[in-house]
């Protein structure tokens, strides 16, 4: 039988007359144009809702735009537009909310042709009021803000000047001409490029890396002939274009740009790009695009110095520079990433690693499902997930892979079962242990969101009929129970819920077509008496993650320990709550080989465990450049990977000497970076 | 019922061999790691060592590694023991236990204990 | 080696009182720590396993809490039949350990 309809699928009890009383209807009294909703805040229910209407004249196009707010998660929204003096926004711009819960909000207008400068509207109390502010440029992107203090902002305009504003957008300073890109790093720092003669364009290859500290009072120049430049976790990367050719390489800082390594990964050229596709504090993960238009590269993974890279997977879908890939962090388990790998007949499989990028292998087959077409052996064949790639091919396919730090082990995506992703219309399947096991939890292409931190799940099925029936789960996706919320079926264009998979409210967004007017409507569905208590010890039972044999005493090491978590009970029916904090245990584990990468001058063979010396360096001493000094290298083949927290064991030695000379192994050399100040 | 029963204790000069049995009845033994754990005379519970159900995975104390030897007969439900090069620290009460099928799992059924004395 | 430390080593109680005994690890050990009873001239049985979940047929009167390093086994009201040792197990980590017993006596 179906998912959901065994006889064991115990139902909630009376749940029709428990939604019905919390089902909030709002119909938007607007032309249904396009509309973008924000959520101001963490837990303060205050949501805000855009809707622009353009109409194209014969010369220009008029648009107008309304500005809604909510307080309640959605259930009931006020018409705001006049506190913004009926100003149509520019959709492109959307709606820059402050990080945190600063309740800080930019909305940049539209002006008129002829204006000196652009026009914002700033509110700092959760968007009740709004203050309009005359800009002394036009901003070319969104308002930025600083991650360490919401007061701090920086936009670019449309003529390359970097614009910094110390008081929420009080005032603006233009701190520098000619930026062509602009980031806030670490302690209000800003990274930015500058070209010298033509243009962004014009000097790609040739830009300058700048730094200020102090908001602009002061510059220090810290790369030169940039190609480009990215922030992840605590690494700063620059691609530098090499002195005799075409060519360019990844150099690396982990100090703010004062000093620079070149990372040991391939050169790119013109037609190539490299794109980091995960970082964190330990450790990044890099695409390196493979020449010709071949649409697959090579990942790579970083020591804790961003410097020695291991390969990690070969043929990785990247279809063009900021083209698509699959490339997916799994939030609800530590260390598992899901992508899609190009095979030699052009088809697409996907691809799991549970060990940040070590190893990776194909999907486990789901119990519940038969092999497709695709498949050569009808008993042998693997679940291939639907992400980026296949939505960017129009693929009937409505939403990327899903997964909530809160939730732990839940995944949710589209998926079919063969030997590669197949065209067919997908199924919608689960894994309740981070990607191990996997089950078919929906049939056909649905909408889906994880609400009460993985206490209930919600879905919608994708159709282009209009809708009015909603899917709930309160066991994981086991058993679902339908809901009908309108009587009058809508056109659905959205779910929404608070970000972060703790609220208990959803939104369906769609809208209803009459014969002569379209209207915006929203329905916001509050689960709480659904899950009618509160969640108590023993709802919770302990749970082993990447547990693959629970008779080996190694069972569930990655990365040198193992985490036990308490999860809600499939079987328990109540609230995890809105303050629930996931709780796991570590344990350390003892060192193996499998906790070590291999060293600078070492590769290992496939399907081996040892590094050996790669061939061309055998018998040289390893001598290497880091920070502009020659380094002297004793080894024997084995780094330890960046996080890895094992201890005893296996224990490699191994010993880096300085051996006090200078050199130059990279672009970026202390002696070319310079300092100045306004 | 759930049982195991241990056999194969005596006394044993230092030096010698023993070799320890345990017969399992009242569940399925091949699905199970067993262990053997051992109580010298007035004091506390030492583990020995354990071997998974298809004895892929065994394991010792550093007490008794190159002495002992664990191994298990599912079809016979029966879990052994060889005890060599005995040393008197090595007297005790020495118990069959089976591990639960949970990871990290807890030792949910025991023996009732035979009897090592090594002594000259 | 991870060192399991019990304390008291001994505890004389009068029935119905509750008993505490407390079991401290060397390291984390998570949840994977379990309690054993043993009365005289027996052989152990499982009390709680995972620190808190009490094995099938026990008196409803033990109970087990804690994680990580710092473990507590109760015996709520005391009974006559409950004098015996009592010992903690951790099946974290490699070697398996046992803490060194609580003797628990009827006053």
């Known amino acids: 039988s179906a998912p959901g309809e065994d006889e064991e699928c115990g139902r909630v009890r009376d749940f029709v007359a428990k939604l019905a009383n919390n089902t909030h209807q709002h119909v938007f009294d607007d032309l249904r144009g396009s509309v973008s909703l924000s959520w101001v805040g963490d837990s303060t229910g205050v949501i805000l809702v855009l809707t622009t209407f353009h109409v194209p004249l014969v010369i220009m196009t008029f648009g107008q735009s309304k500005l809604y707010r909510s307080e309640d998660y959605g259930k009931n929204f006020k018409d705001i537009t006049d506190l913004i003096n009926n100003t149509f926004i520019r959709t492109e711009f959307g709606m820059a909310i402050g990080p945190e819960n600063s309740g800080k909000v930019v909305l940049t207008a539209e002006v008129s042709g002829g204006s000196r400068g652009g026009r914002i509207f700033r509110s700092s109390d959760f968007a009740k009021n709004f203050v309009q502010t005359d800009l002394p440029f036009h901003p070319l992107t969104q308002m930025m803000y600083s991650p360490q203090n919401s007061d701090y902002l920086l936009a670019l305009s449309t003529e390359n000047g970097l614009w910094v504003s110390k008081n929420f957008g009080g005032k603006w300073e233009e701190i520098h001409k000619a930026v062509c890109l602009a980031k806030w790093g670490s302690d209000n720092t800003i990274f930015f490029t500058t070209y010298a003669n033509g243009s962004c364009k014009a000097d790609l290859g040739a830009l300058e890396l700048w730094r200020t500290s102090d908001l602009g009072k002061s510059f220090k120049t810290i790369g030169v002939k940039i190609y480009s430049f990215g922030l992840g976790g605590r690494f700063l990367f620059a691609s530098v274009m090499a002195d005799k050719d075409t060519t360019r390489r990844i150099h690396v800082s982990t100090d703010q740009g004062d000093t620079w390594s070149m990372a040991q990964l391939p050169s790119v050229g013109q037609e190539q790009f490299y794109s980091i596709l995960a970082a964190n504090d330990d450790m990044v993960f890099m695409h390196v695009d493979e020449p010709g238009d071949t649409g697959f590269g090579t990942i790579f993974t970083s020591d804790d110095r961003g410097i020695v890279y291991s390969k990690s997977l070969d043929r990785h879908l990247y279809t063009t520079t900021g083209g698509e890939t699959d490339f997916t962090n799994v939030t609800s388990l530590r260390g598992v990433y899901i992508t899609s790998v190009l095979s030699e007949d052009n088809s697409i499989q996907t691809m799991i690693t549970f060990d940040q990028g070590g190893r990776w292998t194909h999907l486990r087959k789901p119990e519940n499902s038969e092999c497709d077409a695709t498949a050569k052996n009808k008993n042998e064949c693997s679940l291939h997930i639907h992400a980026s790639y296949s939505i960017s091919q129009k693929l009937n396919v409505p939403m990327a892979p899903l997964s909530e730090p809160n939730a732990v082990g839940i995944v949710i995506a589209h998926g079919s079962v063969g030997d590669a992703i197949s065209v067919m219309v997908p199924d919608v399947y689960i894994s309740d242990d981070g990607g191990y096991s996997w089950t078919k939890m929906l049939e056909g292409p649905h909408y889906y969101t994880i609400l009460d931190s993985g206490g209930i799940i919600v879905a919608i099925e994708h159709s282009s009929r209009p809708i009015n029936v909603i899917k709930f789960s309160t066991d994981e996706g086991q058993c679902w129970q339908t809901y009908t919320f309108t009587r009058d079926p809508i056109y659905f264009t959205g779910l929404a819920s608070e970000p972060g998979a703790r609220s208990m409210n959803i939104s369906i967004w769609g809208f209803t077509e009459s014969f002569l007017t379209s209207q915006w409507v929203s329905y916001t569905i509050d689960f709480k008496d659904i899950l009618e208590r509160n969640c108590e010890e023993k709802d919770y039972t302990i749970w082993l993650a990447h547990s693959t044999d629970p008779e080996d005493y190694e069972d569930g090491c990655i990365l040198g320990y193992k985490e036990q978590f308490l999860r809600l009970r499939k079987s328990s029916v109540c609230q995890n709550g809105r303050d629930y904090v996931v709780t796991k245990q570590p344990s350390i584990c003892l060192c193996s080989l499998e906790d070590f990468l291999c060293d600078f001058g070492y590769y290992r063979p496939e399907n081996d465990s040892k590094c050996v010396e790669q061939p061309e360096l055998k018998g040289h001493d390893l001598e290497f450049c880091l920070y502009g000094r020659e380094e002297h290298l004793t080894t024997n083949g084995y780094r330890k990977i960046p996080g890895d927290k094992c201890q005893g064991g296996v224990n490699p030695v191994r010993e880096v000497k300085d051996l006090k000379k200078k050199c130059t192994s990279n672009f970026l050399s202390p002696e070319k970076q310079n300092s100045k100040s306004n | 019922e759930v049982q195991l029963v241990e056999s194969g204790g005596g006394l044993v000069k230092p030096g010698g061999s023993l070799r320890l049995s345990c017969a399992a009845s009242g569940f399925t033994f091949s699905s199970y790691s067993m262990n053997w754990v051992r109580q010298a005379p007035g004091k506390g519970l030492e583990w020995v060592s354990s071997?998974?159900?298809?004895?892929?995975?065994?394991y010792y104390a550093d007490s008794v590694k190159g002495r002992f030897t664990i191994s298990r007969d599912n079809a016979k439900n029966s879990l052994y023991l060889q005890m060599n090069s005995l040393r008197a620290e090595d007297t005790a009460v020495y118990y069959c236990?089976?591990?639960?099928?949970?990871?990290?799992?807890?030792?949910?059924?025991w023996g009732q204990g035979t009897m090592v004395t090594v002594s000259s | 080696e991870i060192v399991l430390t019990q304390s008291p080593d001994f505890q004389s109680v009068t029935p119905k009182e509750k008993v505490t005994i407390t079991c401290r690890a060397s390291q984390s050990i998570g949840y994977s720590l379990h309690w054993y009873q043993q009365k005289p001239d027996q052989s152990p049985k499982l009390l709680i396993k995972?620190?808190?979940q009490s094995f099938s047929g026990v008196p409803s009167r033990f109970s087990g809490s804690g994680s990580g390093t710092d473990f507590t086994l109760t015996i709520n009201s005391l009974e006559a039949e409950d004098a015996a040792a009592y010992y903690c197990?951790?099946?974290?980590?490699?070697?398996?350990?046992f803490g060194g017993g609580t003797k628990v006596e009827i006053k």
């Open positions: 197990h951790q099946s974290s980590s490699l070697p398996l350990t």
């Open positions: 236990a089976r591990r639960g099928s949970g990871s990290y799992d807890a030792f949910d059924i």
């Open positions: 995972y620190a808190s």
């Open positions: 071997i998974s159900s298809s004895s892929s995975y065994i």
